[in-house]
């Protein structure tokens, strides 16, 4: 049994930032969670991750660098992604592993949310690199 | 047949780090369906669940140990890492690796387990 | 966190006596008409061996001397006719919820 995923095909980033909604077949209250968020066709890079608990504030972070936040619908979670560069114009996927209570579920890969961005060309400052390749 | 070996038990200082290794074998760590977890038993104690990770490289923390733990593994050599930082002497006990499978997380395979001592 | 309460913690018996272990969830662990419970069977300097999992099945190669039941938050695990290899520390533990709990155990000594 897997979790189905829907993904909006395009987005564009005009002031780099976007909102990349992640909507499952599968209703996420009181369970225990990971979404995460991979760029790329490959899925290299996970961009964002975001732990639900049933008893806990949504844990969200970012291991690779990416300003993200996230929010937590009953069937979705949302990225919020941040301070993206022109050359994080990408394909983005959705991941959904549910671990508890058991059995463990996770999701048929989607078909992914190009995000092409379009803002203003930010300059990662030397002390702070972009967290990806272009 | 599925096996479960530890290692890398001994004296340690107290805020001294430790690194335990669980060679499987039988089955692959990164094969869905299965995952393992560490549990550790201080002396003449119960047992206490460390934390899982999942054949997708997931992994899922006790909070009373999350800030000192990290569960870790090398798929090419089918072993799972279990990294324990800031060591006390409660942190004594026989560590445990053992398999669950996905259905009903209960534990099938346990390995015999390592004894880990902190003390200066 | 989810706390196992097993009763008694220690009991002393004799080979052939039906012996009754109880743990008792401080919340249901019960998921879409599953118990996500389990009983484990631990010797001196061994590692821990599954008996029951799902609170009433029972894993393969376990004598069947030994059942499981109840739901919710009570749980039961009886052994019908004690064996001198019986004599051991029974731990339940439930997989609902993180973290992983287990009961404090229940020795089954030689009266």
């Known amino acids: 049994n897997k979790i189905l995923v829907k993904q909006s095909p395009m987005l564009v980033a005009y002031d780099n930032a976007v909102n990349l909604s992640c909507k499952y077949s599968y209703n996420l209250f009181s369970r225990e969670f990971r979404a995460s968020l991979h760029k790329g066709l490959d899925s290299a890079v996970e961009v964002c991750v975001v732990y639900g608990n049933y008893s806990q504030q949504l844990q969200v972070y970012s291991k690779t660098g990416f300003n993200c936040d996230g929010k937590l619908g009953n069937e979705s979670v949302t990225f919020y992604l941040q301070n993206l560069y022109v050359n994080q114009t990408d394909i983005y996927f959705c991941k959904i592993e549910v671990m508890y209570p058991p059995p463990y579920l996770d999701n048929e890969k989607s078909n992914g949310t190009i995000i092409h961005v379009k803002g203003k060309h930010l300059c990662p400052s030397p002390l702070f690199p972009g967290p990806s390749k272009p | 047949e599925v096996q479960l070996v530890e290692s890398g038990g001994g004296l340690v200082q107290p805020g001294g780090s430790l690194r335990l290794s669980c060679a499987a074998s039988?089955?692959?760590?990164?094969?869905?369906?299965?995952?393992v977890s560490w549990i550790r038993q201080a002396p003449g104690k119960g047992l206490e669940w460390i934390g899982s990770?999942?054949?997708?490289?997931?992994?899922y923390y006790n909070p009373s140990l999350k800030s000192r733990v990290t569960i870790s593994r090398d798929n090419s050599k089918n072993t799972l890492y279990l990294q324990l930082n800031s060591l006390r002497a409660e942190d004594t006990a026989v560590y445990y690796c053992?398999?669950?499978?996905?259905?009903?997380?209960?534990?099938?395979?346990w390995g015999q387990g390592t004894l880990v001592t902190v003390s200066s | 966190d989810i706390q196992l309460t097993q009763s008694p913690s220690s009991l002393s018996a004799s080979v052939g006596d039906r012996v009754t272990i109880t743990c008792r969830a401080s919340q249901s662990v019960d998921f879409y008409g599953k118990s996500f419970l389990h009983w484990y069977q631990q010797k001196p300097g061994k590692a821990p061996k599954l008996l029951i999992y799902?609170?009433?099945s029972l894993q393969s190669g376990v004598p069947s001397r030994f059942s499981g039941s109840g739901s919710g938050t009570d749980f039961t695990l009886t052994i019908s006719s004690l064996q001198p290899e019986d004599f051991a520390t029974y731990y339940c533990?439930?997989?609902?919820?993180?973290?992983?709990?287990f009961g404090q155990g229940t020795k089954v000594e030689i009266k």
């Open positions: 533990q439930q997989s609902y919820r993180t973290p992983l709990t």
């Open positions: 053992a398999r669950y499978e996905y259905g009903y997380y209960a534990f099938d395979y």
């Open positions: 990770i999942y054949h997708s490289g997931s992994t």
């Open positions: 039988g089955f692959s760590l990164s094969t869905s369906g299965v995952g």
């Open positions: 799902a609170a009433s």
